[in-house]
């Protein structure tokens, strides 16, 4: 806490400028008017204040706004934002996306700070849902943001927001998260034509059910093996050899290299060997000719 001392004659700051970097902490406290600071916050970032001096400036704003800073001040905090505590930020009411962007920029390229984490939570809660523009902004700074939400939290994401999602934003999502996101993506992209639809939906297919994979197999999509390997095993198992062949198109040859890996391995076990042989890939492990095909849903439990 800086002691209250009178400002020396002639040192009263008429504006926020570079001359203030030569002020001692007590002089800043005594000679800088808090209201002036609030209206000229945008200048603070251009001045190389020390951390100690920034502490004084923060203290002045805290005194001026004990209930929390107004958004006009928050938007121009810049590096002073890093001096804020999560408790400070919980007092704020940030509604502008521009304010959010300005503050995220301060922390850009670094792991999420406690300040940023609190800010984002406050902002999203204030909006009521994760709308497209907010998601667009958050994933631009934090590509893994979507995958850091629980399936329950993802369920409140409106389908319209899915348009903001890029393939790399889903890189770290687990299958349960994709289970929630896929139906939203399907709804969001439903009016697109076949090839455009596949480009958009491809990243979400880890949550697709069998019937949707069957439908895709009729559309000449030529799914690559990397995408196929991320499909739900339970969704792949009921597909016929002909359907997988149509789904993969020219990429079907890649099945041989993946025959020991899920879901290909489990799918092979469900197919008649005769049908697998029609692919001409030398896939082995199918049901021998003449054997009765029973429901193999217990296969997983027995393996």
């Amino acid at each position: 806490e800086v002691e209250k001392t009178a400002c020396p004659s002639g040192k009263k700051a008429p504006e926020i400028d570079e001359s203030l970097i030569f002020y001692k902490k007590w002089e800043l406290e005594a000679c800088v008017d808090a209201a002036l600071l609030a209206t000229q916050m945008d200048r603070v970032n251009a001045i190389p204040f020390t951390y100690e001096q920034l502490d004084v400036l923060k203290h002045k704003l805290d005194e001026l706004y004990p209930q929390g800073y107004p958004e006009s001040v928050i938007q121009h905090l810049g590096y002073l934002f890093l001096k804020m505590s999560p408790e400070d930020i919980r007092k704020w009411n940030v509604t502008s996306l521009e304010t959010l962007k300005a503050l995220l920029e301060v922390n850009k390229g670094h792991e999420m700070s406690p300040q940023v984490a609190t800010l984002i939570d406050r902002f999203v809660k204030g909006r009521g849902q994760l709308d497209k523009d907010t998601l667009d902004t958050l994933t631009a700074f934090y590509p893994g943001y979507l995958c850091s939400l629980s399936p329950e939290e993802l369920s409140s994401v409106p389908p319209s927001s899915i348009w903001a999602v890029r393939p790399q934003d889903l890189d770290t999502c687990d299958p349960r998260q994709l289970d929630v996101l896929y139906p939203k993506a399907r709804l969001a992209f439903q009016n697109m034509n076949g090839s455009e639809y596949f480009v958009k939906i491809q990243s979400f297919l880890g949550g697709a059910p069998t019937e949707d994979l069957k439908a895709l197999s009729q559309q000449n999509v030529s799914m690559d093996l990397a995408t196929f390997m991320k499909l739900r095993t339970d969704a792949v198992l009921p597909l016929t050899v002909a359907e997988v062949q149509k789904l993969l198109g020219p990429h079907v040859e890649g099945l041989k290299a993946e025959e020991r890996h899920r879901p290909v391995r489990d799918w092979i076990l469900r197919q008649r060997q005769d049908d697998l042989d029609t692919l001409g890939l030398g896939l082995q492990g199918g049901i021998p000719n003449g054997y009765l095909v029973l429901d193999l849903s217990m296969q997983e439990a027995l393996s």
């Epitope: 792991e111 406690p114 984490a117 934090y142 893994g144 943001y145 850091s148 629980s150 687990d174």
Partner: nanobody
Framework: QVQLVESGGGLVQAGGSLRLSCAAS????????MRWYRQAQGKQREWVAS???????SYSDPVQGRFTISRDNARNTVYLQMNSLRPADTAVYYC?????????WGQGTQVTVSS
Amino acid sequence: QVQLVESGGGLVQAGGSLRLSCAASGSTFGRIVMRWYRQAQGKQREWVASIYDSGSTSYSDPVQGRFTISRDNARNTVYLQMNSLRPADTAVYYCNLGTALSSYWGQGTQVTVSS
């Protein structure tokens, strides 16, 4: 920088139990998802279970009902309780910490289930 260290792996008879631990060091803030993956010899790495920032959990079909993921925030540790183990559970088990920006991996711990 975040570091993850797994422990608790070993050799166990089919039907037995093991408890894996993953201790995280380094500072992370914001939402964190802790996940377990496993990789059997010559196979691809596969997801096993997740525990989200909210505390909710999810599991892959092969382990549902047998494995339980939990965490101790005070100790910065996540656990995987594995019951009714099967030979098919034999693999190197990896701990993963996912933040909104990065994904961190441990070195893995070997679990071998003999019949």
